[in-house]
């Protein structure tokens, strides 16, 4: 009969290298009597006999990992014990070798110029793969802005337009190489105005072209704003070349305005905008009427048909390229403005404006416009439209107009001839005479002017009913 013998491990465990999904075997040869009981641990945790991932054979002396996973690496020990003497142990490492694998590949990125971009590239592999990057067809060189992080991710500081392109990461170790798919880095650039529109001071009826050039990625859109609202008239021509948009707004100038060019582009859910403004001012209408040349002809427009005396000849100012058209458009613009004034003021203002813009004309050797009589002008200003006129003058002092009579080509009453001096030198407004017959009272008005300036129309021919403040003496 054999003598009892304590276990001795005759083949110590060694380090085993294994590829993922391959078989790995540890051998633990033991000499002892009686036959020992052999158990296995991984990282000091007992491996259960019924774990189907393992096969334990040869009385426990052979441990086989049937399909190695990357999580199987660690220290494997066999422990032999037969009750004679102490248990013996031998340990060896399992090094799971792994071809490179990209576990978190890069994705398409849109980034705004100047910000930091990070393209991820997380890898697995044993030996640990080295990560490099390719841009387009060339290996990407690191520099002060561009670095490959320890994690494998690509970090680009202060992204520039030239950083845009297609990128892929490459993971490499002794067992192989893995490539990510190509991803696109798009560099977006905030809209920026390269050329702002220029301000103009022009005569009424002129054509003006405002030009605005902007750049950005994506290419910006350009919109135009007139005095805070979308431009209602004029034609816009646009062209795009090399990410630069050129917008030209052609305007037929009938009123002063602040024109703003707004360049906008979209970055995800956010927009970037750039603005530039220009003013278009009009050389004063009354000045352009002075010393003006023109011709007398019948009015054939639409707006003043019902207001002007039938078959009267009116003055057309040839300082305009197309006098008929320019004056008609000005009166059309003026009438639109009059929508905002009171029912008392509007017809009187219409009569004043039509007769001021289309002055009666004496077709002599030198065609001569006949201005409105001062008294009628003052009647409109200080009686029919007193409230509107005051509001307009207040706005004029503040330098900005919004609505009402501010854009109207109204005459300066004080500079008009008086019908008391020469009744044939000026034009009367029949509408105001007609009102005398139909209106008995007017709202009381406190005049801001001395009483000497108050209109004083002869009752017999051309007068109108007035409030007590306007005596008809």
């Amino acid at each position: 009969e054999k003598l009892p013998k304590a276990p001795v491990i005759t083949t110590p465990l060694e380090t085993v290298d294994a590829l993922v999904e391959e078989v790995a075997t540890f051998m633990c040869a033991v000499e002892s009597y009686p036959q020992p009981e052999i158990s296995w641990t991984r990282n000091k945790i007992l491996i259960k006999l019924f774990d189907t991932r393992y096969s334990i054979r040869e009385n426990g002396q052979l441990l086989t990992i049937l399909s190695v996973e990357d999580s199987d690496d660690g220290i494997y020990c066999c422990i032999a014990n037969n009750g004679v003497g102490g248990a013996v142990e031998s340990c060896g490492a399992l090094q799971v070798k792994m071809k490179p694998k990209i576990t978190r590949p890069p994705i398409n990125v849109k980034i705004i110029e100047g910000l930091k971009a990070v393209l991820p590239c997380t890898t697995m592999g044993n030996p640990k793969p080295s990560v490099s990057w390719i841009k387009g067809d060339n290996a990407l060189r690191e520099n002060s802005r561009i670095a490959v992080l320890e994690s494998g991710s690509l970090r680009i500081h202060n992204v520039q337009k030239e950083d845009a392109g297609q990128y892929r990461c490459v993971a490499k170790n002794s067992l192989g190489t893995a490539y990510s798919k190509l991803v696109k880095l798009e560099v977006e650039v905030f809209a920026r105005i390269l050329r702002a529109p220029e301000s103009h001071n022009v005569t009424f009826g002129s054509f003006v072209t405002l030009r605005c050039t902007a750049i950005g990625i994506p290419v910006p859109t350009i919109s135009w704003i007139e005095n805070g609202n979308a431009v209602s008239s004029g034609s816009i021509q646009e062209s795009v070349k090399d990410r630069v948009i050129d917008s030209r707004l052609q305007l037929f100038i009938t009123k002063p305005g602040l024109y703003t060019c707004i360049a906008t582009n979209k970055h995800g859910e956010k927009f970037s905008t750039a603005k530039a403004a220009a003013t278009v001012s009009i050389a004063e209408w009354s000045k352009s009427q002075k010393d003006s040349q023109g011709y007398c002809a019948q009015y054939r427009g639409e707006v003043c048909d019902a207001v002007l005396a039938k078959d009267a000849l009116v003055f057309f100012n040839t300082s305009y390229r197309d006098p008929e058209d320019a004056q008609e458009l000005l009166i059309h613009t003026a009438w639109n403005e009059l929508k905002a004034v009171s029912p008392l003021c509007r017809p009187a203002a219409e009569a004043l404006l039509c007769n001021h813009l289309f002055q009666e004309c004496s077709p002599g050797v030198v065609p001569t416009p006949m201005p409105i009589c001062r008294e009628y002008c003052l009647a409109v200003k200080e009686l029919f439209c007193a409230k509107e006129w005051q509001a307009m003058e207040g706005k004029a002092h503040r330098g900005l107009y919004r609505s009402g009579m501010h854009l109207l080509p109204v005459p300066e009453c004080s500079k008009l001839p008086s019908m008391h001096r020469d009744p044939t030198a000026c034009t009367r407004l029949p509408y105001l005479d007609y009102k005398k017959e139909n209106i008995t009272t007017f709202p009381s008005i406190t005049s801001s002017r001395p009483s000497a300036d108050i209109p004083n129309l002869p009752a017999s021919t051309s007068s109108f009913a007035v409030s007590p403040a306007y005596s008809m003496t």
Epitope: S235, F252, Y295, C296, A297, Q298, Y299, R300, G301, E302, D305, A306, K310, D311, L313, D322, E324, D325, E328, L329, H332, P363
Partner: antibody, heavy 121, light 113 residues
Framework: ELQLVESGGGLVQPGGSLRLSCAAS????????MSWVRQAPGKGLEWVSA????????YYKESVKGRFTISRDNAKKTLYLQMNSLKSEDTAVYYC??????????????WGQGTLVTVSS | QAVVTQEPSLSVSPGGTVTLTCGLS?????????PDWYQQTPGQAPRALIY???SRHSGVPSRFSGSISGNKAALTITGAQPEDEADYYC?????????????FGGGTKLTVL
């Protein structure tokens, strides 16, 4: 290039209706007055109707008043002439013409090639 | 309704000068009638020559000029060319208010012999 192209002409019986259209291109349509002018076979020109830039007024030759309606759609850059109760004397080539300015009346500085309207039983 | 009158036909030698006139059956033509002149060659649409008495449309040769002479509007061709052979129409603006009218004359057939 400025173009005016008329369409909608054809043969119609007396008392019938036609709608002529004039498609404009190559200029800012809503900055100009427009007119319809007709020319009977072998005859002279005859103004029919006019409309200013904004469509705010309409004007007609006395003989077509109440039967013809001029209109414009500035968004579509199109001028129209709706002709009802047509008579044999309305037979003509109908020209669409552009004014040199905004108001309805004045020189017609661009013309279409015309569309023939024949009123016959 | 006023009738606009024109010479039915006129002839001119190449290089010669010819004046076409445009009158009113009742009254005189004035600048308030804004006389306009058109040229039409066979099978073609009319072409604007002169507007508002004496203004030439763009592209119109300087040999064409307009005026008011006496009580009529006039179109003068100075140094006529063979290509000037055509029908010439004058048109006058009439009326006010809703009675505005634009009346063409019967046309003048110009022959360049």
């Amino acid at each position: 290039e400025l173009q005016l192209v008329e369409s909608g002409g054809g043969l119609v019986q007396p008392g019938g209706s036609l709608r002529l259209s004039c498609a404009a291109s190559g200029f800012t349509f809503d900055d100009y007055g427009m007119s319809w002018v007709r020319q009977a076979p072998g005859k002279g020109l005859e103004w029919v109707s006019a409309i200013p830039w904004n469509g705010g007024s309409t004007y007609y030759k006395e003989s077509v008043k109440g039967r013809f309606t001029i209109s414009r759609d500035n968004a579509k850059k199109t001028l129209y002439l709706q002709m009802n109760s047509l008579k044999s004397e309305d037979t003509a080539v109908y020209y669409c013409a552009k004014r040199s300015g905004r108001i309805a009346f004045g020189a017609l500085d661009a013309w279409g090639q015309g569309t023939l309207v024949t009123v016959s039983s | 309704q006023a009738v606009v009158t024109q010479e039915p036909s006129l002839s001119v030698s190449p290089g010669g000068t010819v004046t076409l006139t445009c009158g009113l059956s009742s009254g005189s033509v004035t600048s308030s009638n804004y006389p306009d002149w058109y040229q039409q060659t066979p099978g073609q649409a009319p072409r604007a020559l002169i507007y508002s008495t004496n203004s030439r449309h763009s592209g119109v040769p300087s040999r064409f000029s307009g005026s008011i002479s006496g009580n009529k509007a006039a179109l003068t061709i100075t140094g006529a060319q063979p290509e000037d052979e055509a029908d010439y129409y004058c048109a006058l603006y009439m009326g006010r208010g809703s009675n505005k009218d634009y009346v063409f004359g019967g046309g003048t057939k110009l022959t360049v012999l």
